[in-house]
């Protein structure tokens, strides 16, 4: 229904706390360089204004759209051009173009230092002194680094953060309590960030239809007992919610997400038998719980879908009458029977089926033509199954760090033009798939591996789009979203690449490496590995193993030496010389 004042409506629906959190996220995602203090001032002004509109919906400016109100706030910031350059040009535009302009200026790789977690004692002190401000800083820091983070989900992580601090700050060993718990929240949040970025990419590049297809497949897997009409309704609602969040309409997105959770809990009987536990929780946990819900049990007896989609002589007639509904039904029926497939695979199968019908229904004997489609599905199914098998075997053999290194070599050979930090980040994330997925039961491996890899590769594409350097990467990133992972997997060594000159300084290390945390040490070593491959793209596995083994020994030896600086200064050049020789 239409409301006189959109902002008053959202304030009342969401409540002050969530309203303020969402406004802070919105501002932090749009203006990523502004300090917390500046944003919190704007948040307070917007909140005060919303309260006046709640009191009187006819008050001045209360009828304006939220985009207009937020945009006006952002454009009123002094020195906007000094800090943001051409983003200030957006302010000359009218809505909705102004908001579109802001969206286009979101930076997926902002020049911000990595978020450093303070010492446990310091964290607890500032948390206990002012929990609201502490959690506000958390929202601000995450949102500005991840401008597409799913806002209502970020509120959930802030709540988790709050729970951990409340629990651990009363313990005697605060650090021992905080570190593993906060690491777990961070890991989940980082995965959530890349997954949501993938959804926004899908929405931006391929529109609502592509996202809705993704949602139909996912919902059908989770809720195999729900009717197609129910799945369609859920997918339509989820598409609207994600469109809003990806478009910066965070208040509407969060409000609609809460509505969807309410609907699902009121209609459990027609959706899934697994929802009750989620439905007993408060709103943020409820929505999150529903988003992560386990698959319902598949009906005991589901017939083959061949009768409706391959054997029926009327397939072309049914397809022509309502193409999207027919294909949607195919995707629904296939997906509810295959929770063991990735959504990407299910969408590739649906795409192949659509292409087959387009071709066959124009021919003289359509049934004979589309009757062979099942054989064409086989390679599509077997390719990702083999990918999972070979990669999980490699992970089990090498462990996470070794597996990351194997992927780093592979991807540096595929796209040596890509910057080393981007390659290292991508390989480290891709390598985590082993820990995340390979330990799962067989039926869960494929969806876990492929859908996670797709999200990580989307991040690589988003970063590469900003500064394109590799034709091969551009080619894989330009195609359909569901074909990306197979496209990257099929890439081989880039024969057009002219190897990088050997620069001794690239492989020169100092004693500061000794005091780095393990993760940073790994990144240093992986940076060296990528540079080695860029210098010698055709180096064999044994050559790289030798050089990296030497390097690890060298670091270990010098970090144990009495005079570390002297050791690095004298042993370093020897290492460089030996490495050059080993790779010659």
């Amino acid at each position: 229904e239409a409301h006189k004042s959109e902002i008053a409506h959202r304030f009342k629906d969401l409540g002050e706390q969530h309203f303020k959190g969402l406004v802070l996220i919105a501002f932090s995602q749009y203006l990523q360089k502004c300090p917390y203090e500046e944003h919190i001032k704007l948040v307070q002004e917007v909140t005060d204004f919303a309260k006046t509109c709640v009191a009187d919906e006819n008050a001045e400016n209360c009828d304006k759209s939220i985009h207009t109100l937020f945009g006006d706030k952002l454009c009123a910031i002094p020195k906007l051009r000094d800090n943001y350059g051409e983003l200030a040009d957006c302010c000359a535009k009218q809505e909705p173009e102004r908001n579109e302009c802001f969206l286009q200026h979101k930076d997926d790789n902002p020049n911000l230092p990595p978020f450093q977690r303070p010492e446990a004692e310091a964290m607890c002190t500032s948390f206990q002194e002012n929990p609201t401000s502490f959690l506000g800083h958390y929202l601000h820091e995450v949102a500005r680094r991840h401008p597409y983070f799913y806002a209502p989900e970020l509120l959930y992580y802030a709540e988790k953060y709050n729970e951990v601090l409340t629990q651990c700050c009363t313990e005697s060993d605060k650090a021992a309590c905080l570190t593993p718990k906060l690491d777990a929240v961070k890991e989940k949040a980082l995965v959530a960030a890349v997954r949501q970025r993938m959804k926004c990419s899908s929405m931006q590049r391929f529109g609502e239809r592509a996202f809705k297809a993704w949602a139909v497949a996912r919902m059908s897997q989770r809720f195999p007992n729900a009717e197609f009409a129910e799945i369609t309704k859920l997918a339509t609602d989820l598409t609207k919610i994600n469109k809003e969040c990806c478009h910066g309409d965070l208040l509407e997105c969060a409000d609609d997400r809460a509505e969807l959770a309410k609907y699902m809990c009121e209609n459990q009987a027609t959706i899934s038998s697994k929802l009750q536990a989620c439905c007993d929780k408060p709103v943020l946990q409820k929505s999150q719980c529903l988003a992560e819900i386990e698959h319902d049990n598949i009906p005991a007896d589901l017939p083959s879908i061949a009768a409706d989609f391959v054997e029926d002589k009327e397939v072309c007639k049914n397809y022509a009458e309502a193409k999207d509904v027919f294909l949607g039904t195919f995707l629904y029926e296939y997906s509810r029977r295959h929770p063991d497939y990735s959504v990407s695979l299910l969408l590739r199968l649906a795409k192949k089926y659509e292409a087959t019908l387009e071709k066959c229904c124009a021919e003289g004997d359509p049934p004979a033509c589309y009757g062979t489609v099942l054989a064409e599905f086989q390679p599509l199914v077997e390719e990702p199954k083999n990918l999972v098998k070979t990669n999980c075997e490699l992970y089990e053999k090498l462990g996470e760090y070794g597996f990351q290194n194997a992927i780093l070599v592979r991807y540096t050979q595929k796209a040596p033009q890509v910057s080393t930090p981007t390659l290292v980040e991508a390989a480290r994330n891709l390598g985590r798939v082993g820990t995340k997925c390979c330990t799962l039961p067989e039926a869960q491996r494929l969806p876990c591996v492929e859908d996670y890899l797709s999200a990580i590769l989307n991040r690589l594409c988003v970063l590469h789009e900003k500064t394109p350097v590799s034709e091969k990467v551009t080619k894989c990133c330009s195609g359909s979203l569901v074909e990306r992972r197979p496209c990257f997997s099929a890439l081989t060594v880039d024969e057009t690449y002219v190897p990088k000159e050997f620069k001794a300084e690239t492989f020169t290390f100092h004693s500061d490496i000794c005091t780095l945390p393990d993760k940073e040490k790994q990144i240093k070593k992986q940076t060296a590995l990528a540079e080695l491959v860029k210098h010698k793209p055709k180096a064999t596995e044994d050559q790289l193993k030798t050089v990296m083994g030497d390097f690890a020994q060298f670091v270990d030896k010098c970090c144990k030496a009495a005079d570390k600086d002297n050791c690095f200064a004298t042993e370093g050049p020897n290492l460089v010389a030996r490495s050059k020789e080993a790779l010659a």
């Epitope: 007896d301 083959s304 063991d340």
Partner: nanobody, 124 residues
């Protein structure tokens, strides 16, 4: 893990009958679609018949319809293939397969576990 062992194969005259059994161990079969496939000498493996988890749906290749019957007894963890009116062209190695998830029933790539096979020879 499911281990499947076929039995009941042998030599039979054209027009004769055989009953193949597929015994599962290691897990209950009630959560699996069960199927029979065969490979004739020098030919590709082909689908013969399949049955849904609780037996409500059965599927057959056109070449065996009306002659073969697939059934299952989940309590005995066994699937069966009753083969009547056998023909020389039915000569093949018959494999039993189990698939947790299946959309088509007839596609070998949807089956996760396979037996070693039992040989059926139809000859006069």
């Amino acid at each position: 893990e499911v281990q499947l062992v076929e039995s009941g194969g042998g030599v039979v005259q054209p027009g004769g009958s055989l009953r193949l059994s597929c015994a599962a161990s290691g897990s209950t079969i009630s959560s699996y679609v069960m199927g029979w496939f065969r490979r004739a000498p020098g030919k590709e493996r082909e689908f013969v018949a399949a049955i849904s988890r609780s037996g409500g749906y059965t599927y057959y290749a056109d070449s065996v319809k009306g002659r073969f019957t697939i059934s299952r007894d989940n309590s005995k963890k066994t699937a069966y293939l009753q083969m009547n009116s056998l023909r020389p062209e039915d000569t093949a190695l018959y494999y039993c397969a189990a698939g947790r998830y299946s959309a088509w029933y007839s596609q070998s790539y949807e089956y996760d576990y396979w037996g070693q096979g039992t040989l059926v020879t139809v000859s006069s």
